[in-house]
Amino acid sequence: FKVATPYSLYVCPEGQNVTLTCRLLGPVDKGHDVTFYKTWYRSSRGEVQTCSERRPIRNLTFQDLHLHHGGHQAANTSHDLAQRHGLESASDHHGNFSITMRNLTLLDSGLYCCLVVEIRHHHSEHRVHGAMELQVQTGKDAPSNCVVYPSSSQDSENITAA
């Protein structure tokens, strides 16, 4: 399977909400011995290898934000911790998974990474990630609403095995 990032750049005004999205593509094994671990984290834009370092989102680690389920099942993060920080990650039946961030501040700007780990019990793991940038802006140059920039077809299916 692959992870697609429909948008490579989100530009949002301060105070707005945004939902960053990744999509699981390709054949997904729905067997009982397969589960999917999905999560989000930030990574420094200065890194040579994109998404190689896992940094927190609003003080929450990738462990705090993870979803764990089988196949294309729907799932949401535990509400208490994430929602206290204005965050919610979710996954639907169609392979889409997202993180919603409320009341954006400039400090939310940066590179966001979605990670999917296919776990086959008693076998190996398969890891793929997608990356997108969020720029939060303020002042006269800031848009009135979030503006999204589509990934090129090559970028949108760009995957890296971890």
């Epitope: 420094s44 834009r45 940094r55 003080n59 400090l107 940066g110 590179l111 939060v136 800031a142």
Partner: antibody, heavy 119, light 106 residues
Framework: QVQLQESGPGLVKPSETLSLTCAVS?????????WTWIRQPPGKGLEWIGY???????SYNPSLKGRVTISVDTSKNQFSLKLSSVTAADTAVYYC????????????WGQGTTVTVSS | AIQLTQSPSSLSASVGDRVTITCSAS?????IHWYQQKPGKAPKLLIY???KLASGVPSRFSGSGSGTDFTLTISSLQPEDFATYYC?????????FGQGTKLEIK
């Protein structure tokens, strides 16, 4: 190694505008992080003035009542502070620093420059 | 905004002493960082994320705590450790500094 270096006049007259520049080497300020100004009045603690994100937007300490502007010169890899309508209360050592906004820490600092507001 | 209170505000100690500085937050915080500032110098990151030593910091420095109460400990004071120490909290999206603790030679 990331290095920051402040420069600017050490003496500013009351009601005038204080202008300082921070030159950064070893890292591109448009790559990542928040680039900040912090000051320390004589014998006192540290006060955050404001920061500019790598993407160009800035945020300021509300206590400075709109007197602050932080701007960037990407061609020289430096960012600047302007503080208008200064008074003796703005006398301080001014530091520029890199703010790691992932973990909320100031990981690299300039050596500081002393600015005295006096006629 | 979360307030940080350091205690003591000043402290006299001798070389070889074990010293503890505390930092209390007015409500729970995610991260605490500690800085050391010597006279005429910029602050230097000493300990980050409560207990991690910054690059080049000697192992005699340690940090601990959680929630609202945090400590910086120097296990055996060296002459170069006499300085002012600041704690700083990070609770997205705000940060604040403590008022500082001045460590002087007895």
């Amino acid at each position: 190694q990331v290095q920051l270096q402040e420069s600017g006049p050490g003496l500013v007259k009351p009601s005038e505008t204080l202008s300082l520049t921070c030159a950064v080497s070893g890292y591109s300020i448009t790559s990542d992080y928040a680039w900040t100004w912090i000051r320390q009045p004589p014998g006192k603690g540290l006060e955050w003035i404001g920061y500019m994100m790598y993407s160009g937007s800035a945020s300021y300490n509300p206590s400075l009542k709109g007197r602050v502007t932080i701007s960037v010169d990407t061609s020289k890899n430096q960012f600047s502070l302007k503080l208008s309508s200064v008074t003796a209360a703005d006398t301080a050592v001014y530091y520029c620093a890199r703010f790691d906004h992932y973990y909320g820490r100031f990981d690299y600092w300039g050596q500081g420059t002393t600015v005295t507001v006096s006629s | 905004a979360i307030q940080l209170t350091q205690s003591p505000s000043s402290l006299s100690a001798s070389v070889g002493d074990r010293v503890t500085i505390t930092c209390s937050a007015s409500s729970s915080v995610s991260y605490i960082h500690w800085y050391q500032q010597k006279p005429g110098k910029a602050p230097k990151l000493l300990i980050y994320e409560i207990s991690k030593l910054a690059s080049g910091v000697p192992s005699r420095f340690s940090g601990s705590g959680s929630g609202t109460d945090f400590t910086l400990t120097i296990s055996s004071l060296q002459p170069e450790d006499f300085a002012t120490y600041y704690c700083q909290q990070w609770n997205y999206p705000l940060f604040t500094f403590g008022q500082g603790t001045k460590l002087e030679i007895k």
